[in-house]
């Protein structure tokens, strides 16, 4: 194969591979044929003047995961064929200027995982084609005004986990074909008004584990081809009213782990492609009639992990879609009777980990299609006469960890739990808090003739009773995975999402098994 | 590009464990969704479950809890599905496959992984 | 669970004809805003390779030959022109509960 060094690998495909810690030098000869040249895992620490000048045919060249930290600016001398570059997972601190002159092929250029200090409007200048340049995982205090002006047929760009604290308005003002821009985990406290205002075809924007604690009003406007706006793990305290307005293509949008207090009304404009909308972990205490009425596709609603203690009966109006909603782990004491009469679409609901005390007769009066419903662990003494008996596709309902008041007026609630025995699982069974003679037994086989007979009749709306039949189909247990992690605190400990384990899974989703998705 | 490249067959003894990978690139492993497929030899489809690797929460078609358990490795961006006691009826291949929300389709499916239980 | 019938079982189909597919559910998988129906290709070896989506909305790089139709309980796959490439077994499937997939439809050329 025209002479192929004895470290490497040459296959018929013009393509060699040169890899080993024996390396510390770009092995020669390389066959004059080479388009792909890929030297990985080797104990190279420096290019030396041009070690490729013989293989000016080369498209694609990976110089990835090696001790590399000096590279002389005469190094790819010769390679305008090239197209592909990458100087990935190497030890680089400085980029010598004029690096990549004559390079005028070149597309992707990798530069990730470095310790890159710094990047100069020089630089890159020369890079007219390219395409994509990946930065990330670099040492990025700052990038100067200019440094990708040259870059105009750029299309992605990724300068995430380095150390930026701020961005110049004016750094991607020329990057008009852009439509990847990744600024995730760094150190930005604010986005300048403007700064992505040239970016009109940007399709995604990953801000997402930053230190932003403030969106200017203006910040999208101008970037209505956007599809995916990540912004989870910031400061944001607060939504400017029309800051989502002007984003009709948004399928993506990740505002979890924030400091979010309020949701006004309409604060998420028109988004038709919006199927899933995560809020968990901010500080959200109530929701305003109306406030996703415009996300009418919405199928994925997640609240769990706020302090919400009131929900306005309009609240979920125009979520017809809807096909779970996760409000656990909140402050709920009380719910309105129609707040979920909209969501017509409504499988799953978890209200676990609240404070809820009672709940309407008719709160899943037009949810007829519930085949979910999580109540654990909330202050539930009793549940108003026929709540679940027009829900044929209910098959699982989790009511332990409340204080079930076991006397006379449980019968009703007790007999159909002895019906429905198989929706209620098999891990937990809910249990009597009082009369203290019955505390700990089991709601399902406690004789309510020893407990202390009502001295009261709840005031509650109850629905005409519909009998469940034990020969209609059966919907079988379909409990979540082992979940013997159920959360009780109002915010689980942890650190990092990514790394929770599956067992752990219901803790942000607070959903089950029991659709599929 | 978008890829999902799964392990290897596999042959297994009646009663043993299974684990097979599937590893994803080309996209943002952490913000798919990612579905495992039964297809038995000669026979259709049937859905084992997902995962959802950002916070790897699950959710298992009821017929497979117990038999599969499926977690991820988001460093490797790589999903895992490990199937446990089996049995000759767990002879199949096994795809894992991408989806963009919970409820959409899955647009992208890696090659197939074949498990043969045979004594 | 929501069992999927898809007709026939298998389809002869001349070059250039137009071939129907059909996939009953045992219950409604729509809503007002969605049909939660999907269509897959299988070629022998291969893994399925999605063609409809939403019932009547086109992958991209899938030929416009192919399209969806269909609400409620009945759906329609309908490849209008059909080529040497087409042949295979085609798959429905409904994420409007715990997923399912039809038994199959196997497209030969007549």
């Known amino acids: 194969y025209h002479g192929c060094p004895s470290e490497c690998t040459c296959s018929r495909a013009s393509q060699v591979e040169c890899t080993g810690a024996r390396i510390v030098a770009v092995p020669t000869p390389l066959p004059w044929n080479a388009m792909s040249l890929q030297i990985l895992n080797t104990h190279i620490t420096e290019l030396n003047e041009s070690p490729f000048l013989n293989i000016s045919a080369l498209i694609a060249l990976r110089i990835e995961k090696n001790e590399l930290s000096r590279i002389t600016p005469g190094a790819f001398r010769n390679l305008g064929s090239l197209r592909y570059l990458s100087l990935a997972n190497n030890k680089l601190q400085v980029l010598p200027i004029g690096l990549f002159q004559g390079l005028d092929s070149l597309e992707s250029l990798l530069l990730s995982s470095n310790q890159l200090l710094q990047i100069q409007p020089a630089h890159f200048s020369q890079c007219s084609n390219l395409k994509e340049l990946q930065l990330h995982g670099n040492h990025l205090e700052y990038i100067p005004d200019g440094a990708f002006d040259h870059l105009v047929g750029l299309t992605k760009l990724n300068l995430g986990k380095n150390s930026l604290t701020h961005i110049s308005p004016r750094v991607f003002q020329h990057l008009g074909n852009l439509q990847v821009l990744r600024l995730y985990e760094n150190r930005l406290t604010d986005i300048p008004m403007g700064t992505f205002d040239g970016l009109v075809n940007l399709q995604e924007l990953a801000l997402q584990q930053n230190q932003i604690g403030l969106l200017s009003p203006g910040l999208f406007h101008n970037n209505h081809n956007l599809q995916r706006l990540y912004l989870s793990n910031n400061h944001i305290s607060q939504l400017p009213p029309s800051v989502f307005m002007q984003l009709p293509q948004l399928n993506r949008l990740t505002l979890f782990g924030n400091s979010l207090k309020e949701l006004s009304p309409g604060i998420f404009g028109p988004m038709p492609n919006l199927r899933e909308l995560w809020l968990y972990d901010n500080h959200i205490s109530s929701l305003p009639d109306n406030v996703f009425s415009n996300l009418r596709q919405l199928q994925v609603l997640i609240l769990s992990r706020n302090q919400i203690s009131f929900i306005s009966p309009g609240a979920f109006n125009g979520l017809t879609e809807l096909r779970e909603l996760s409000l656990h782990t909140n402050a709920l004491q009380d719910l309105d009777g129609n707040v979920f009469r909209m969501l017509a679409n409504l499988q799953n609901i978890s209200l676990q980990n609240n404070r809820l005390r009672q709940l309407p007769g008719n709160i899943f009066a037009n949810v007829n299609g519930l085949m979910a419903i999580q109540l654990q662990n909330n202050q539930l003494e009793n549940l108003p006469l026929g709540i679940f008996d027009h829900l044929g596709k209910l098959c699982e309902l989790r009511l332990y960890d409340n204080p079930w008041r076991c006397d006379s007026d449980i019968l009703p609630l007790r007999n159909w739990l002895l019906l429905n025995q198989p929706r209620l699982g098999t891990d937990t069974v809910p249990v009597c808090f009082s009369p203290a003679n019955v505390r700990g037994q089991s709601l399902i086989i406690i004789n309510v003739n020893v407990a202390v007979p009502s001295v009261h009749v709840p005031e509650v709306p109850s629905y005409p009773e519909t009998p469940w039949y034990p020969d209609t189909p059966s919907y079988p247990d379909t409990t979540s995975v082992s979940s013997t992690t159920e959360l009780t605190s109002p915010v689980e400990d942890y650190t990092d999402l990514t790394t929770i384990q599956v067992t752990d899974d219901r803790s942000v989703w607070g959903m089950t098994q029991a659709q599929s998705g | 590009e978008v890829q999902l490249v799964q392990s290897g067959a596999e042959v297994k003894k009646p009663g043993s464990s299974v684990k097979v990978s599937c590893k994803a690139s080309g996209f943002t492993f952490t913000d798919y969704y990612i579905h495992w497929v039964k297809q038995a030899p000669g026979q259709g489809l049937e859905w084992i479950g997902l995962v959802y690797p950002y916070i790897g929460g699950t959710n298992y078609n009821q017929k497979f809890k117990g038999k599969a358990t499926l977690t991820v490795d988001t460093s490797t961006t790589t999903a895992y599905m490990e199937m446990s006691s089996l049995r000759s009826e767990d002879t199949a291949v096994y795809y894992c496959?991408?989806?963009?929300?919970?409820?959409?389709?899955?647009?992208?499916w890696g090659q197939g992984t074949t498990v043969t239980v045979s004594s | 669970d929501i069992v999927l019938t898809q007709s026939p079982d298998s389809l002869a189909v001349s070059l250039g004809e137009r071939a129907t597919i059909n996939c009953r559910a045992s219950q409604s998988v729509s809503t007002s805003s969605y049909s939660y129906m999907h269509w897959y290709q299988q070629k022998p070896g291969q893994p399925p390779k999605l063609l409809i989506k939403y019932a009547s909305s086109l992958e991209s790089g899938v030929p416009d030959r192919f399209s969806g139709s269909g609400s409620g309980t009945d759906f329609t796959l309908t490849i209008s022109s059909l080529q040497a490439e087409d042949v295979a077994v085609y798959y429905c499937?409904?994420?409007?509960?715990?997923?399912?997939f039809g038994g199959g439809t196997k497209v030969e050329i007549k």
């Open positions: 499937e409904q994420s409007h509960e715990i997923r399912t």
């Open positions: 496959a991408r989806g963009d929300n919970k409820y959409d389709a899955m647009d992208y």
